[in-house]
């Protein structure tokens, strides 16, 4: 059995008080000092079984130098075994031993939970010499104890290579419950059960838990720590906390907000960054995510044209980055664009719609009926064609681009000419004789250069060899251009 020192119990209605027969103290006092000459202890505790020889860890000295008698075994005297006190109080406890004067250089060390206490600890050793023995009292004091001071303290003394160890003094620092696990904020699905956990420790134990939801107690009776609260589902945001009670009082956890997942708010600020003939680059600012991460977004595109069938094109894209290049659009067209994003709950409403336009496109067809013939008297090549049937979306014709490639004896040279939109014929100077000239023509608008016509080849003879027959693009269905010289 141990002798126990306790501070005075403060009854708390939910919990039993201290064990019968136990003592609590908050006095900063020297406990269980031995009666030694000239020293009066502040408190005395008689050993559990007075008069019984101590058979713990003792050192049995050899015979004296005279060889006449054996000295009694050395052992630390019994002291209080268990000190219970509140956090932030001061405590002082001690070990004492009487050592025959024949032993020199005795030192006492303090150990806590198997580790030696070194450095900045308040340990004092006092010596009280007598004729035959010296009473040694080693005191250990802690000011403003904390929970980390809890543990088993012992004294050790080395004599003649023997180690003498005291009984342990168990220090129990009591205080308000201390949370080791608190509820965490969560985002949950509406009307779906979920768990919250709360765990707190003493000492003193037991620690009992009350759950609080929106300021109302969930459990009418205390639950032992740890406690798991199964919340049966929520329809709106709620705040939870837990109260931990022990016989020192109550500690309240942080309050945590539990949010209900919902569909996101619609995106805002849809902006146009760049338009081309067939694409529009947009960006948007995501709305509130509804307490659930965005999964993806949908870009909805409607053509604004009284003649269009009003169908909506839908382009799915990742939620991040908040940007998307809409492709496969018609040139020179007006569109209404909206964005919607989704999370695990569902789709947001569509953002406010914005208007955007594509620019002019390049022509989609080449000029028709391209004819090429040589005008030797002027030393040039005459080219004629018909204006292509361009769509409105291609924009206004601004001219033509003529590509003529001259090939002779392994040499090839391409030249480009630009002519105005009112022309349907052009003349180019002969660059090389005894060579083949290959001509292609493309229509040009502000939107760009259209496709080139099929190549038409004409042979330019050496001087004096002239044939006025033209070369022209083939009639539809012919596989290759016809070359007439």
């Amino acid at each position: 059995a141990i002798t126990e020192a306790r501070e005075e119990a403060k009854p708390y209605p939910l919990f039993p008080g201290p064990l019968p027969g136990s003592l609590q103290t908050d006095h900063t006092s020297l406990l269980s000092l031995p009666h030694t000459s000239g020293y009066q202890p502040a408190l005395m505790f008689s050993p559990t079984q007075p008069g019984r020889p101590y058979t713990g860890n003792v050192a049995i000295p050899r015979v004296t130098s005279a060889g006449s008698k054996l000295l009694p075994p050395l052992a630390f005297k019994h002291t209080v075994g268990h000190i219970i006190l509140s956090e932030h109080k001061d405590v002082k406890f001690n070990c004492s031993i009487s050592v025959p004067n024949i032993y020199q250089d005795t030192t006492i060390s303090w150990w806590k939970d198997g580790k030696e206490l070194l450095g900045a600890h308040h340990a004092i050793t006092q010596f009280y010499p007598d004729d035959e023995v010296t009473a040694i009292i080693a005191s250990f004091s802690i000011t403003s104890v904390q929970r980390s001071d809890n543990g088993s303290y012992i004294c050790k003394m080395k004599i003649n290579n023997e180690e003498i160890v005291s009984d342990p003094i168990y220090i129990e620092v009591q205080g308000l419950p201390h949370f080791t696990k608190q509820p965490e904020s969560m985002n949950v699905t509406r009307n779906t059960a979920f768990n919250l956990t709360c765990q707190a420790v003493g000492p003193p134990e037991p620690v009992n838990i009350f759950w609080v939801q929106n300021s109302s107690r969930v459990n009418e009776q205390p639950e032992k720590s740890p406690s798991v609260l199964t919340v049966p589902g929520l329809t709106e945001m709620a705040v939870f906390s837990c109260e931990a009670h022990n016989d020192k009082g109550l500690t309240v956890s942080k309050g945590v907000q539990i949010n209900i997942k919902a569909i996101p708010s619609p995106p805002t600020e849809v902006s146009i960054h760049n338009s081309t003939a067939h694409s529009i680059l947009i960006s948007w600012v995501p709305g509130f995510d509804g307490y659930s991460p965005f999964r993806n977004c949908s870009v909805q595109v409607k053509e604004v044209d009284p003649l269009s069938n009003g169908s909506v094109m839908i382009f799915n894209t990742s939620a991040s980055p908040h940007m998307y290049q809409i492709k496969q659009l018609q040139a020179l067209a007006n569109y209404s664009i909206g964005v919607s994003c989704m999370n695990e709950i569902g789709w947001s409403a569509v953002s406010p719609w914005i208007l955007a336009s594509t620019t002019e496109g390049a022509p989609s067809v080449a000029p028709l009926n391209v004819t090429v013939f040589l005008n030797e008297s002027r030393d040039n090549v005459d080219i004629r064609w018909m204006k292509p049937l361009t769509k409105r979306q291609a924009g206004e014709l601004v001219g033509y681009r003529i590509s003529h490639v001259w090939q002779s004896a392994g040499i090839s040279k391409e030249l480009l000419e630009e002519v105005g939109q009112n022309n349907s014929r052009a003349q180019i100077s002969v660059q090389v004789h005894n060579a083949t000239c290959t001509v292609r023509i493309a229509a040009v608008t502000k939107g760009g250069v259209g496709p080139f016509s099929d190549p038409v080849k004409i042979f330019i003879p050496a001087h004096g060899w002239v044939d006025h027959a033209p070369s022209s693009t083939p009639a539809p269905g012919n596989a290759d251009p016809v070359l007439i010289i």
Epitope: S216, V218, N219, E220, Q221, P222, L229, G233
Partner: antibody
Framework: QVQLVQSGSELKKPGASVKVSCKAS????????VHWVRQAPGQGLEWMGW????????TYAQGFTGRFVFSLDTSVSTAYLQISSLKAEDTAVYYC???????????WGQGTLVTVSS | EIVLTQSPATLSLSPGERATLSCRAS?????MHWYQQKPGQAPRPLIY???NLASGIPARFSGSGSGTSYTLTISSPEPEDFAVYYC?????????FGGGTKVEIK
């Protein structure tokens, strides 16, 4: 299995006292509160209050203070409702029920009819 | 205290006809519990915390609601469902019951 068994019907004269018992079994009695509910003839349910079986602390609803006393004997897992100075309007069926989280009454006694008549 | 008003006081139905029982609170409550009582019997737990079926209760019973408005629905009542139904709030003391709705056979 969880059971709440109440004492039998009582016929009392005005001014007398009655003590209704509610014996619990099938669970740890001190882990759950015991609620008391009154139902007058042809009327609805009326919550009277509850007793904390861990501390013995009673809580009374308005209108049930003074003459009504909740008590416990945890050694026999039993809750009691005592009504003193009985009046004719105390004639009712009295139910005990086990209280769990969110003040939900998950198990009920079979009810005790107390009749107050001269 | 929070007053719970149940409506209608009586609901006359043919078996199989959907029943919708309402319980309104005088101020917002966290959860609503529902109990069924048949003549001469103790109340029987039906729905816990607004929408959770008590043990052994068939799926034709369902609960919903939030704030001050709560509903108990019997999708297709069986003959044994004709009884009195009470709501009870959890939020603040005192715990209160509604006045009850009697579901009877038309």
């Amino acid at each position: 299995q969880v059971q709440l068994v109440q004492s039998g019907s009582e016929l009392k004269k005005p001014g007398a006292s009655v003590k209704v018992s509610c014996k619990a079994s099938g669970y740890t009695f001190t882990n759950y509160g015991v609620h008391w509910v009154r139902q007058a003839p042809g009327q609805g349910l009326e919550w009277m209050g509850w007793i904390n079986t861990y501390t013995g602390e009673p809580t009374y609803a308005q209108g049930f203070t003074g003459r009504f006393v909740f008590s416990l004997d945890t050694s026999v897992s039993t809750a009691y409702l005592q009504i003193s100075s009985l009046k004719a309007e105390d004639t009712a069926v009295y139910y005990c029920a086990r209280g769990v989280r969110y003040a939900y009454m998950d198990y009920w006694g079979q009810g005790t009819l107390v009749t107050v008549s001269s | 205290e929070i007053v719970l008003t149940q409506s209608p006081a009586t609901l006359s139905l043919s078996p199989g006809e959907r029943a919708t029982l309402s319980c309104r609170a005088s101020s917002s409550v966290g959860y609503m519990h529902w109990y069924q009582q048949k003549p001469g019997q103790a109340p029987r737990p039906l729905i816990y915390a607004t929408s959770n079926l008590a043990s052994g209760i068939p799926a034709r019973f369902s609960g919903s609601g939030s704030g001050t408005s709560y509903t108990l629905t019997i999708s297709s009542p069986e003959p044994e469902d004709f009884a009195v139904y009470y709501c009870q709030q959890w939020s603040s003391n005192p715990r209160t019951f509604g006045g009850g709705t009697k579901v009877e056979i038309k």
